[in-house]
Structures are given as C-alpha cells and as structure tokens.
Interface confidence: low
C-alpha cells in the first residue's frame, strides 16, 4: 500500500488551531515512473457534505512529502469530508477523513467501519441532543432509510446493513428530520472486496495474518498497519510517538500523538494513534489495553507487563506476543520485514536465530514463494546467535512475494515471513532532449520516461562523436537536473544516450535509444559598425558598414540587418549571406517611417554583437504620377510639355518637378520646379538646337511622388548654342534642383 497518512488535530477548543496534515513516506514522493509525478493534494470534498462557504482554506507545502491545511474560522468549517491524494500512476491513492461536529445532535459511536464482503455492518448513532423527530439515514448524500424517533435503542439509532458488498462503501449520515445537516452523525463504511482473510482477483489468496489490528488489502494482500506498527504483518511496534510504514514519521508537539486522528489508505480507514482512544483521541488506554484506539488486549503471561503503545514487554527468558514462548525455543532474530532486490541479481540473504540447543547451519532454511527450499552455504556462530547466509539463485519476477526463514531444533521451531520485492531496472523509452547548444557544449535534459521500476538513483549520460568508434564518454548526473556536456568539438554531431539506475546491486538498466545532438559553430565575436546610409527613394535605403580588422580568418557566414519600426512595433530582418559584403540595399520599406537600424555578424545560428543603432527617417510617399505627358517642339530652343493631373490625390499638390536629360547623354539630369500646380503645361526654354531630349515629371505634396512616363522630343534646327534649359514662367527665380 502507499505510505500515506492524513493527520487531523482534534484539539477543538479553537477551530483556528485545527489543522490537517498529509504526510507521504513514499520513496521519491512526487516522482512517478515517467518523470516528475503529481504532488500531494489535500482538500475538502464538498460533494456529499456541503458546508456554508467561508474564507478559503490555506494550503502550505513542506517539500514534496507533506502538505498542511489551515485557516478554519468556525466549527462548521470542520464538518465534512477531507481527502488527501498521493502516489503516482497506478499507485495514486486517496485517504479520507470524516469530521463530526462535537456539538451535533447525533454522534457516531465509531466513525470508520471496515468490514469484509458479505458481512453485516452496524452503524450506531448516539443521541447527544435529543429531538423528537424521525432520523433520516443517507448513503453518499442520497436518502437511504428512516427510523422513527422512538426506535432508539439505549440512546442509539442503529442502521444494520446485512451482506454488504463493495459498492455499499461510502459516507453514511444520520440526521434528525428538519435539523441542520451539520448536526448529523457522519460515518465512513469501507467494504473490502473479499471475505475475511482473503485477497486477490478471485479472492483465492490467503492474507498473511495481519497483527495488532492491521487490515489485509484486498488487492495486493499487504497489511495496512495501524499507526505505530510496522512490518509485513504489523508485528513490530514503533517507538512511542512514531508512525509511517517504517516508523519514520514523528508526531508533532510535546504530547506525542495525543489528540491526533490518523487516516490511512483503505481498507484501514481512521483511528487514534497507538496508546490513545476516545472521540478526540485524548484518553490514554486503560490498563491491559494497547494499540490504536486501545482496541488490543495484552494478556501477558510469564510476568510480562503491558505497555499501552507496544503491548507485552517480556521479562528475560521469554518472548512472543503474550510472552508465551520460552527463550529455549529457537527464535528468528531481527529479520527485516521487507527486502528489495533487482531482477537477475544473486543476492545473499542472512537469517539469524538463537535458542537452546543452539541452532547450527543445517537447522536454518529459507523457503521461496514457489516452495523451493534453499540451504545456507555458510554460518557465522556467535555466543548469542547463529547467522546463516543464503546465496540466492538469479532472481526472476516470479520470486516476488513472501519468503520464509525457518529454524528447527530439538527445542522447537520458529519461522519468520518476510516480503521480497523483485524490481526491474529502469530502461529509458525515449532519447534525452536537447535544451540548448553552443559551440563547445550541449545542455541536455536527461529525465525521460522509462519502463521498469523507480526510484531513479543515478542517471548516466553516454556520449561520443557520431559514427565514431572511440569509447563512450560517461557523465553521472542528478536525476532532477539538466546536464551540460562540456569541452566538445564545434560543429560536430554527438550520439547521446541515457542509462538509468535504481538503488541496489544490479540496478543499472539497459541504455536507452540514441539521439543525435550537434554542437553549434563558434560564436561570432566581431561587432560591425554602421558607416553610412542614404535614402534612395521613399521606400529604399542603402546601408554600408565595416568590421574591425583582426588577424586570422573571419568567423561568420553573413550579416543580419534589423530595422525596428517602433510606431508599429514591427521588426524587419534582412539576411546578407556573404561575410564579405559591406553594403546592402533595403527595399519595400514604409515611406514616412522612423526606423532604428543595426547590423550583426552571424555564424550558423549564432548572432554576434549588434552594431550601435542608427536612426533613419524615410521621407513620406508622394502622390501618383502625372498622366499623359506629351512633348512638342516649338523652336530650335523650346519644347512645350503638357500633361494631366494625377488621379486620387491624397492632398493638394505643392509643385511639379520636371526632369530633363539629353538622350544618350552621360551627364546628370536637370530638375526644374513648376511652382504653379494648377497648370497642366509648361515651356522648357534654353535648349540646344537639333538635340533630342528625354522628359519625365512628378508631383510633390509632402514628399515627391512617382515619375510619369518618359517622353522624347527634338528641338528644331539652326539655332545657336543655349546656356541651358529653363522654364517659361519666372525662369529667373527657378533654381535647378540637382
């Protein structure tokens, strides 16, 4: 069974001091066999017993092993069902605690009832505050039965449930008609899936005979031991104030386990700790009684004395539950109640015995679950005991179960059963996961799902260059941490595999499947500098940069240019794939936009440091192009241009710009402003005779717009050489915009 205990502090004078604590003694609590398992959950279950809403309860975690619920403000907060859930996967287990109000009209004589399939269960509700109304019994919140108020027997209302079956399990309540549900007596009925002393799928297996009030689990045949007892059959008492499957937990506070209710996995239910009884677990056991709820009687013989926590304490020369066995009868000493080994190992098991006559090697034997008897290969004889050592053949899964050490002498015989768990070493089902990579290191998550048994004690990571025949390098890591493989070669593929181990000899599992992880190439370290930039249009920008001069080859594959448009929150990235490039033309930008620009060297997927940024403002986009531009020669020095205004203008045109260029000429074009935007014609003067010219024009609003189509026209012949073209109107005031 899962080692899970729900503790309720029943010192109820002040609800604010009330708390519930759930404690897990599981190895690696919070760890499932697939990776990290689910945490402990502790909550109030309002499905059956609903209480008025109050302030939320406070949950405090103490590591993965303990969780505490506090913050109860009034007594009614306490009434109802609380549950703790722990364990992982198929072992996930719910422990339930039912709390009754001490001031209720009806109180349960006993809250938890564990019965066997087919038994008759009797729930008894004691009258605490009498009302002369009927009593309603409910099962899991639904109406079940009614008793007339005068059917009380000796101040109690009894509900008899004959021939109970597992579906009858649940929360039962007895409530006076028309009384508050908080005044009910709440019970918990647990019906084992088998008859008394049996367990297993068809109830064909025999329970081990649980001692000291332990309850045989109907699924796995294990004893769920009362708080304060341990061992395969609950045969050993813990020291006072201790609980848990291995007595590993300690009751809080100076008065030990007084005032605490302990709830354990079904089919045990809840009880006081060992040595205590009463509805609030505050009364010590009466003389001659011991154990949880003081349900056990000592009946010590041969001068034994009764200890309320552990039972009979025998005088020298006697042993046994009731001190009924003479020390002359042989006795198995200090045999562990449970042993764990790994599959296919060949462990040595020791069994020590004392007695008179003294046990010898041949008088001690070991019996496996299949009935095979092993004889000891060696015995160590000491004055007070003989220890026989058994060499166990290679273990198989079928060896899991109850083994028995038996000693026989002429003085009698003794035997001790103990449980052997054969565990399967874990084997990874998946390859490790690459988290990050650099040029000389890989960061790997080694924790993968696995077959076989946990807990994982060590994780080995094996790695070597891909397709290499060299020996594997191995690193042993903590199961819960990511691993950094150091001192690797850059730009190299590595085969990486996980090997998991569980505790104990032979706990190493087979290697898991490999995965290929490739180191990055060296990080580029040079920082470029933006040398200059100029606008080549409303949406085009030419950028140039330089790199510091350093000796040796350039480490880099190219450059990344980044333009950040802060207004729109957009980033544009331009990849320049040559490490030799020092200039780039960026096109398709948004006119009228303020950009932040920087450049970085890259190598593989790694980026070097960015250049200091530049801030560039692109001019706003202008209007569309003028339409139907036409040129007509007027003389040997004049050509008239006519056009139509652009369509769909975003605003009033401020001017037109005319570009004039000699056809086939190598010189720069001349730009002439037409400052009267309402005009649709102009005469260009001062041209050379018999010369062919090219004309195009564009409009301007806030920025220059698109160029029109280009037109050609020749001046007429026989003119003189002119000084240069000018526009007809206000020609003297016009400058040529180069």
């Amino acid at each position: 069974a899962v080692d899970l205990t729900l503790l309720a502090n029943l010192r109820l004078t002040d609800p604010q001091r009330f708390f519930l604590t759930c404690v897990s003694g599981e190895a690696g609590a919070g760890r499932g066999s697939d990776a990290w398992g689910p945490p402990l959950l502790l909550e109030k279950d309002d499905r059956i017993v609903r209480t008025p809403p109050g302030p939320p309860l406070r949950l405090a975690r103490n590591g993965s092993h303990q969780v505490t619920l506090r913050g109860f403000s009034k007594p009614s907060d306490l009434v109802g069902v609380f549950s703790c859930v722990g364990g992982a996967g198929a072992r996930r287990t719910r422990v339930i605690y039912v709390h009754n109000s001490p001031g209720a009209h009806l109180l349960p004589d006993k809250v938890t009832h564990t019965v066997n399939k087919g038994d008759t269960a009797v729930l008894s509700a004691r009258v605490h505050k009498e009302k002369q109304t009927d009593v309603i019994w409910k099962s899991n919140g639904s109406y079940f039965y009614t008793l007339d108020w005068h059917e009380a027997q000796d101040g109690r209302f009894l509900l008899q449930l004959p021939n109970v079956q597992p579906p009858s399990s649940g929360i039962y309540s007895a409530t006076y008609l028309e009384a508050s549900p908080l005044g009910s007596a709440f019970f918990r009925l647990i019906v084992r899936g088998c008859g008394a002393g049996r367990w297993g799928p068809g109830c064909t297996k025999e329970c081990p005979g649980c001692l000291h009030g332990g309850v045989c689990h109907d699924h796995d045949g294990e004893c769920v031991c009362p708080p304060g007892f341990t061992g395969t059959r609950c045969e050993q008492a813990c020291r006072e104030g201790r609980f848990g499957q291995s007595c590993q937990e300690q009751c809080p506070g100076i008065s030990g386990c007084r005032g605490l209710t302990f709830c354990l996995p079904d089919p045990y239910g809840c009880s006081c700790g060992s040595g205590w009884r009463g509805s609030q677990c505050q009364e010590a056991c009466a003389p001659g009684h011991f154990g949880a709820d003081c349900r056990l009687q000592c009946q010590c013989q041969n001068g034994g004395t009764c200890d309320r926590f552990s039972g009979c304490v025998c005088p020298s020369g006697w042993h046994g539950v009731h001190c009924e066995k003479s020390d002359r009868i042989p006795q198995i000493l200090n045999m562990a109640s449970e042993l764990e080994f790994n599959l296919e190992t060949m462990p040595r098991i020791n069994c020590a015995a004392a007695g008179n006559p003294f046990p010898v090697r041949g008088s001690i034997e070991l019996r496996k679950p299949d009935g095979t008897v092993l004889l000891s290969t060696k015995a160590i004889v000491e004055p007070e005991k003989t220890t026989a050592e058994f060499e166990v053949p290679r273990l198989v899964l079928a060896d899991s179960g109850f083994w028995e050490c038996r000693v026989s002498t002429s003085g009698g015989q003794d035997s001790r059963r103990f449980k052997v768990n054969v565990k399967v070493p874990p084997v990874p089902l998946a390859a490790p996961r690459l988290l990050t990579k650099q040029s000389r290191q890989l960061v790997v998550s080694p924790l993968v799902s696995f077959s076989g048994d946990g807990p994982i004690s060590t994780v080995r990571l094996h790695y070597r260059p891909q397709d290499s025949t060299m020996d594997w390098s191995t690193i042993v890591v903590d199961p819960s941490e990511n691993v950094t493989l150091m001192n690797l070669r850059p730009k190299t593929g590595y085969s990486v595999r996980v090997q998991l181990s569980r505790p104990g000899e032979g706990g190493e599992g087979a290697w898991g499947p490999p995965t290929l992880m490739t180191t990055d190439c060296p990080e580029p370290l040079l920082q470029p500098w933006l040398e200059g930039w100029h606008v080549e249009g409303t949406d085009r920008l030419r950028v140039s940069w330089s790199l510091p001069l350093v000796p040796g080859p350039l480490v880099g594959d190219g450059f990344l240019l980044r333009l950040w448009d802060g207004t729109r929150g957009q980033e544009r990235r331009e990849n320049v794939s040559s490490p030799q490039a020092r200039t780039a033309l960026l096109t398709g930008l948004t006119p009228g936009t303020h950009y932040q620009l920087d450049v970085q060297l890259y190598h593989c997927t790694l980026l070097g440091p960015a250049s200091p940024p530049a801030h560039v403002l692109l001019p706003p986009s202008g209007p569309p192009a003028p339409r139907h531009l036409h040129a007509q020669a007027l003389s040997d020095s004049e050509i008239q241009l006519t056009w139509k205004h652009p369509e769909a203008l975003p605003g009033p045109i401020s001017k037109y710009v005319v570009e004039v260029q000699v056809a086939g000429g190598a010189g720069d074009p001349l730009w002439i402003d037409v400052d009267r935007p309402e005009e649709t014609s102009t005469i260009i003067r001062g041209l050379n005779a018999s010369t062919r010219y090219l004309f195009r024009m564009r409009a301007s609003i806030q920025g220059l717009g698109d160029w029109s189509n280009t037109v050609e026209e020749s001046t007429l012949g026989n003119g003189l050489q002119a000084e240069g073209p000018v526009q007809e109107s206000r020609a003297a005031e016009e400058g040529l915009d180069q």
């Epitope: 990776a35 198929a90 899964l397 799902s449 077959s451 076989g452 891909q466 087979a510 490999p514 290929l516």
Partner: antibody
C-alpha cells in the same frame, strides 16, 4: 504465451468516432510501452501512436495528432485508441504491438488487427 | 520526422538467387533499424533488429547491415516461402517511421 487481441473496429461514417481496444495477456503488461500501427488496404505500414508503461507519456504521428488519443488501463491489461473525426484515409487494419524494452529495437509481438472502415 | 525510403518498390527473382533490398534514412539513425516480413493476410514478422541482429527463429539466409543512413537486407538464397513484402523501420526518434515496403516475387 504473449497474446494481443484487438477489437472495436467496424464501419463508421466520416466525422464519426470509435474506441479500439487491445487486450494483452501472457506478460507483465504494466512494464511495457505499447504502440498502434495501421495498414490501409493494399498499402504499407504506418506508425500511429505510442504510450509509456504507466501511461504518463504519449506520442502520435502528425497525421492523427489532435484526433486520436492513446490510453491504457494497467489493472485490466488493456490498451485503447480513441479515434475521432474519422476520415476516409483512416480506413485501415489497426494493429497493436508491444514496444521493445532494451537493446532489441523492433516490434516482435503484434495483434491480429481490427479493421476500421470509414465510408458514407 | 525521419523519412525512410526503400528500393526497389518491387522485385522478382529466382529461387536460389541472392536478393538485396536497401533502405535509406533522411538523417542519421545510428543502427536503430528493424526489418519486417509481411505475407498476404498476415501480421508483420520481425526479422532483424538494431540493423544486423537476427531475431531468434529467423533462417540464417536473412542478414542485415548498415548504419547511419544506408541499410541493406540480404537474402543469400531465395526460397519460395520468402515471397512477401519487406519493410524497414527506424527507432532513432519518434515517430518510428516505416519504409514504404518492397514486394518480393518469385520469377
């Protein structure tokens, strides 16, 4: 003797659902990963899904991701495949197989398969 | 996902011939490759695992070789009962993809 027995196949309309089961016996079911593989009529084998021994980890082929769900009940030694939003191209024989547990990477144990036909 | 490509798609050979089927992975998979034989109406049968290890009970005329990206299944002397479709499957990373299959017939 290891045995895997699939069931739950049949004729279903496009967009419909089925739940395929695979009952396992003859080995400790809770110690092995399990997989589903399918084979369309006259076509090759297609790997569909995997689940780890405890059921805590699953994986799917891209072609079924979001529509199929693999699960298992170790107490019943049974593997399941819930198939939703079925399409004509999901018509196939669905096999369950036992995943390997160590160095021997290969599927040695297969079920006999169950046929799923998606047609209107 | 890793793609597995088998060649040829089908082949016809005579009894006693040496037959070779190849399988290529789209990226390195070490030696994590299995070969299966499937006869009409039957379930696949594991022949070879980890590229070259013969599954117990499989006739020794079957052998496998290769690692990384290129793998070969060889039948040293073809027998009538070897008529089947043969598949490769990678186990290096999920999904554990299969090749498209090679149909083998007797001439």
């Amino acid at each position: 003797e290891v045995q895997l027995l699939e069931s739950g196949g049949g004729l279903v309309q496009p967009g419909g659902s089925l739940r395929l089961s695979c009952a396992a016996s003859g080995f400790t079911f809770s110690m092995y990963g399990m997989v589903w593989v399918r084979q369309a009529p006259g076509k090759g084998l297609e790997w569909v899904s995997v689940i780890s021994p405890s059921g805590g980890n699953t994986g799917y082929a891209d072609s079924v991701k979001g529509r199929f769900t693999i699960s298992r009940d170790n107490s019943k030694n049974t593997l399941y495949l819930q198939v939703n939003s079925l399409r004509a191209e999901d018509t196939a024989v669905y096999y369950c197989a036992r995943a390997p547990r160590g160095y021997s990477y290969g599927y040695y144990y297969w079920g006999q398969g169950t046929l799923v036909t998606v047609s209107s | 996902d890793i793609q597995m490509t088998q060649s040829p798609s089908s082949l016809s050979a005579s009894v006693g011939d040496r037959v070779t089927i190849t399988c290529r992975a789209s990226q390195g998979i070490g030696h994590y490759l299995a070969w299966y034989q499937q006869k009409p109406g039957k379930v696949p049968k594991l022949l070879i695992y980890t590229a070259s290890t013969l599954q117990s009970g499989v006739p020794s005329r079957f052998s496998g070789s290769g690692s990384g990206t290129d793998f070969t299944l060889t039948i040293s002397s073809l027998q009538p009962e070897d008529v089947a479709t043969y598949y490769c499957q990678q186990f290096n990373s999920y999904p554990h993809t299969f090749g498209q299959g090679t149909r083998l017939e007797i001439k």
